[in-house]
Interface confidence: low
């Protein structure tokens, strides 16, 4: 599992040559059933906010027990609270399900701060605001946990949407999405639109607010603007991608691109922040500080520990730079860039003492385990996890928070040579073992 500010809270203290076809979402691409168009029943099926995670309603067992489940592309277990816990309003009661099957096997998952453990079984699972199917899936029934469930988050379990290789206790435990695709006609892809609030929400507002959409089996054109650009999934474990260049307000950080992916870069909806390797974080903060030097902020702000507040409606967005990540494209020597605004990387938080102010935390932090493109990044974009074609697509989200001057962007192509050198390679000649 990933080190750092992950949800549930796992905090630690890490272009194409011209004339080539662009890998955009076009009508020329072969159709797959259910791949394109409108998925009305799935739009707005997520609730929550970046600080506490985005969850979808699911039902488990027979008769169905309804639970809210955190959507996590950074893990691969479907795990639900299955015993009373002070932070849970409800939990999965296996003894009440006639379709529950015990696998007679335990599972233990430690995080940086906390853990969960439980018992493995299978049961019938469906997603009310998802495809009209029921699947038998592996479920980890969480019987004991520490600092896993979040008070007031309103979710009771976690849906790990990554690949089997990182499933616990081992890769033989088939993840939910694999079971879904195997047992139904749902195409092997899903897409996420996470809609950050842009302003602090109190508890009642969170429960009533729209958090976004998880489109299972397809792409909904109403959820993005412009074109979708795709980056290859480097390896099917986490959703690993390769970053080839980083810019702050258009200024290249000028680092060896290997540093950006040390030792991996992943797209993870279960992490709050944009997390960067130590050297990259330090260079990025130095550059962001320089760009925003008209105001001085305490060191604790840049460490993500201290809030900074402005009088309601007066946040000086314009003094903060935009951040661009260049991702490897699908075509040789081609990359594209995704650009986020301070509206994404300054996370709104409620400060009870100054409720009339707008308060923010700096949501870029240091990592010892590579780059993690968490909710901070994802809230700017509609993100397509195209597992069938081993690629991840980015387009500007129709719900991203911006101002009158700047907007998040997905742009390309950019010629970028030697991109393969930006990733960390396994020191062996035959890399085919990676694909087993």
């Amino acid at each position: 599992t990933q080190h750092g500010i992950r949800l549930p809270l796992r905090s630690g203290l890490g272009g194409a040559p011209l004339g080539l076809r662009l890998p955009r979402e076009t009508d020329e691409e072969p159709e797959e059933p259910g791949r394109r168009g409108s998925f009305v029943e799935m739009v707005d099926n997520l609730r929550g906010k970046s600080g506490q995670g985005y969850y979808v309603e699911m039902t488990v067992g027979s008769p169905p027990q309804t639970l809210n489940i955190l959507v996590d592309t950074g893990s691969s277990n479907f795990a639900v609270g299955a015993a009373p816990h002070p932070f849970l309003h409800r939990y999965y009661q296996r003894q009440l399900s006639s379709t529950y099957r015990d696998l007679r096997k335990g599972v233990y998952v430690p995080y940086t701060q906390g853990k969960w453990e439980g018992e493995l079984g299978t049961d019938l699972v469906s997603i009310p605001h998802g495809p009209n199917v029921t699947v038998r899936a592996n479920i980890a029934a969480i019987t004991e946990s520490d600092k896993f469930f979040i008070n007031g988050s309103n979710w009771e379990g976690i849906l790990g949407l990554a690949y089997a290789e990182i499933a616990r206790p081992d890769d033989s435990l088939e993840p939910f999405f694999d079971s879904l695709v195997k047992q139904t006609h749902v195409p092997n892809l899903f897409s996420l639109q996470l809609c950050g609030a842009g302003f602090p929400l109190n508890q009642s507002e969170v429960l009533a607010s729209v958090g976004g959409s998880m489109i299972i089996g397809g792409i909904d054109h109403s959820l993005y603007t412009g074109s979708l650009w795709y980056t290859p999934i480097r390896r099917e474990w986490y959703y690993e991608v390769i970053i080839v260049r980083v810019e702050i307000n258009g200024q290249d950080l000028k680092m060896d691109c290997k540093e950006y992916n040390y030792d991996k870069s992943i797209v993870d909806s279960g992490t709050t922040n944009l997390r960067l390797p130590k050297k990259v974080f330090e260079a990025a903060v130095k550059s962001i500080k320089a760009a925003s030097s008209t105001e001085k902020f305490p060191d604790g702000f840049w460490l993500g520990e201290q809030l900074v507040c402005w009088q309601a409606g007066t946040t000086p967005w314009n003094i903060f730079p935009v951040i661009s990540l260049y991702l490897m494209g699908e075509v040789t020597n081609q990359s594209f860039r995704i650009t986020i605004l301070p509206q994404q990387y300054l996370r709104p938080v409620e400060d009870v003492a100054t409720s009339q102010d707008d308060c923010y935390k700096f949501a870029i932090s240091q990592s010892s385990t590579g780059t993690v493109m968490g909710a901070v990044i994802m809230e700017g974009f509609y993100v397509v996890f195209d597992r069938a074609r081993k690629r991840i697509g980015f387009a500007v989200s129709a719900c991203h928070v911006h101002d009158e001057f700047r907007t998040a962007a997905v742009e390309g192509p950019f010629v970028t040579l030697d991109m393969e050198d930006c990733g960390y390679n396994i020191p062996q000649t035959d890399e085919s073992t990676l694909m087993t």
Epitope: Q2, G12, G114, D170, D171, Y424, N425
Partner: antibody, heavy 119, light 107 residues
Framework: EVQLVESGGGLVQPGGSLRLSCAAS????????IHWVRQAPGKGLEWVGW????????DYADSVKGRFTISADTSKNTAYLQMNSLRAEDTAVYYC????????????WGQGTLVTVSS | DIQMTQSPSSLSASVGDRVTITCRAS??????VAWYQQKPGKAPKLLIY???FLYSGVPSRFSGSGSGTDFTLTISSLQPEDFATYYC?????????FGQGTKVEIK
Amino acid sequence: EVQLVESGGGLVQPGGSLRLSCAASGFTFSGYAIHWVRQAPGKGLEWVGWISPAGGSTDYADSVKGRFTISADTSKNTAYLQMNSLRAEDTAVYYCARGPFSPWVMDYWGQGTLVTVSS
Amino acid sequence: DIQMTQSPSSLSASVGDRVTITCRASQDVSTAVAWYQQKPGKAPKLLIYSASFLYSGVPSRFSGSGSGTDFTLTISSLQPEDFATYYCQQSYTTPPTFGQGTKVEIK
């Protein structure tokens, strides 16, 4: 059952080389960090370095940087510690250990293999 | 590098005693500290991670506490099999560093 088995230790002269192996079984090798930790006779534990078998990234203690190299072969579920330019102070029991990427701890250890550097 | 300093370096205790070992980091390491037990001729075993979380299968008489720079390992009621050397380790940053060890001997 998780198992880590080191091999390749022995007596070597100062300036010489040795390659230790760590054969792993009972878990998804590429899903964990593999660390090498050493313990000089009668002394405490000293971290030597680590590798991510999946990504290939490595890091080393300053005391061995430039002399030791860690590698891994995921097809064999084996990590290696190549030790060059050995010194008397490198004499120790060398352990390989598995750890999650977070937290940065070692939850399973091998039995260790003794490396003696002496003329 | 972050230095980890353990105290005492050794102690004598009897079965049933409450034993406390402390570890001080040379800088703030939040709660990123682990504790290990090592018996002669054997490999270390993980007891506690993230300062206070008991590793799977470790008896509940072991507990850990602390944050920032000061950390404690407590054995609430010492058992015969607990006589060993105990090491703390910071997992806050690379390189991970260990304390020099505390040997718990039979009185």
